[in-house]
Amino acid sequence: NECPELQPPVHGKIEPSQAKYFFKDQVLVSCDTGYKVLKDNVEMDTFQIECLKDGTWSNKIPTCKIVDCRAPGELEHGLITFSTRNNLTTYKSEIKYSCQEPYYKMLNNNTGIYTCSAQGVWMNKVLGRSLPTCLPECGQPSRSLPSLVKRIIGGRNAEPGLFPWQALIVVEDTSRVPNDKWFGSGALLSASWILTAAHVLRSQRRDTTVIPVSKEHVTVYLGLHDVRDKSGAVNSSAARVVLHPDFNIQNYNHDIALVQLQEPVPLGPHVMPVCLPRLEPEGPAPHMLGLVAGWGISNPNVTVDEIISSGTRTLSDVLQYVKLPVVPHAECKTSYESRSGNYSVTENMFCAGYYEGGKDTCLGDSGGAFVIFDDLSQRWVVQGLVSWGGPEECGSKQVYGVYTKVSNYVDWVWEQMGLPQSVVEPQVER
């Protein structure tokens, strides 16, 4: 009752290994690391056969098949390159995940290298079987901003891609008869969030209550250059509208808000986020130069006669931008206190502009980002949001524009976006 001699499979072994096998002897067939037992197209770790009474084996010896990790999982905003020839996905093969640069970068500077393990899963030394994360790069426009920058008032056109974080926020309240419509700007912070001024998203009511407009009435345009041609822009509806809980309609204190987009927007040369600053109560230093863009009034001196005879509008069709210095807080406070009217420049605001006037933001620019280039991180950081000014015409002498000091609200912004700050630490100002 002796059974025939057994040959172990290629890349496998038989245990116990004996010279002879008799009735009721059992053997266990297993495979080398990185291989699996294959029997009748079924993969298994081991396979047992037995020597039968009639001197035959209960089954044929199975084969050993190399482990296949199969096609690696898709990485959102990422690419996969195969290190092994013929794009092999078998044991010990290597792949490398990378992010769609320059718009995304890998979280925690991960190598992105994954190896096909003996268990048939792609493994990374740090993340294990978890995929890496591609985070949007911030504050790095695809075009570098020129040093000579004119003003929004009497302004200069912004070339497409200069302000890739610039959003046009259109509010159309169709629940009212007649419909109410206005717009402002905002700044893209991530693929799903827009930062803007609260007064842009406050429902226009007779009283001083602060109620956000309905999300259904908000449309956000990104990658937009000319408001007359929205075909090339990405438009998105709002999933959430979040006003700062302490926004004061009387003095515009805490004039900051967020819009969560219905769907994340694809980033590209004309759509990229701006960086958030670090939490710092001082805000931007006096005399630092910042840039602000918008589709607001670019020629405040055009007469009503000209407007009605030419059929033109007072707002800009093409995105305009201006370079403005931060004004010392005391100087700005004094400037507004000397005016008739109840003007209050709080610690949550800063001013920018020129004593002699001529360069300023204006109606329609509200909510736009005042950005400053951070030399250390080599990124553009949103330090302010266009908030208010006046009472004289925009660009008037000694009438500074007032901006929300974003650095006072960094924690609030992260909290609303539901992102731990550590996740995006490399992106913020150093």
Epitope: Q204, P300, T303, V304, D305, T314, L315, L363
Partner: antibody
Framework: EVQLQQSGPVLVKPGASGKMSCKAS????????MIWVKQSHGKSLEWIGV????????SYNQKFKGKATLTVDKSSSTAYMELNSLTSEDSAVYYC?????????????????WGTGTTVTVSS | DVLMTQTPLSLPVSLGDQASFSCRSS???????????LHWYLQKPGQSPKLLIY???NRFSGVPDRFSGSGSGTDFTLKISRVEAEDLGVYFC?????????FGGGTKLEIK
Amino acid sequence: EVQLQQSGPVLVKPGASGKMSCKASGYKFTDYYMIWVKQSHGKSLEWIGVIKIYNGGTSYNQKFKGKATLTVDKSSSTAYMELNSLTSEDSAVYYCARGPSLYDYDPYWYFDVWGTGTTVTVSS
Amino acid sequence: DVLMTQTPLSLPVSLGDQASFSCRSSQSLIHSNGNTYLHWYLQKPGQSPKLLIYKVSNRFSGVPDRFSGSGSGTDFTLKISRVEAEDLGVYFCSQSTHVPWTFGGGTKLEIK
């Protein structure tokens, strides 16, 4: 609800002046233009002028230049029209009406909301 | 000034019938920007005018779809497909293509 509430009737003697008001509510006053229109008894409508609330800029129908003066008080969301050197020809109902928003891409100049009207009677 | 001529002066109709108002301008109302700024207003007895149609054919919010506007250049028409009692009043056409903006003399819609 968007409303324009006009002041009560004005009764003046010939040669005198008369001022009327138009108080706006239910919308952001400074974002819109305000138009003034005259309707003589049983007659059609005549455009007098327009004021840009945002900065007080005005444009007048040549016929009413020197006759009408348009002003605004932003703090009370009120537009005003003063008529001077009144004659019996100026006896009419005067309407304020809301013009386009500064945010409109096409300043179409139709008037979507009209005031209640102020009757001016010039009589000795 | 652009003269706006409305015909007829008075339009007697039966309730449920169609009404048609004509408005003719002394010069073309096509603006250099391509738009035509011709609008229609209704003034009911003892009330202020109300906007019905703007830029030739666009119904203002809240205006029933029985109202429609058409025309181009110098000839324009307002139609009411089925007249209701609440439609009675004076209908004015108005142009804002040329300064000064002008109104037609009005057509009074009356019940037969």
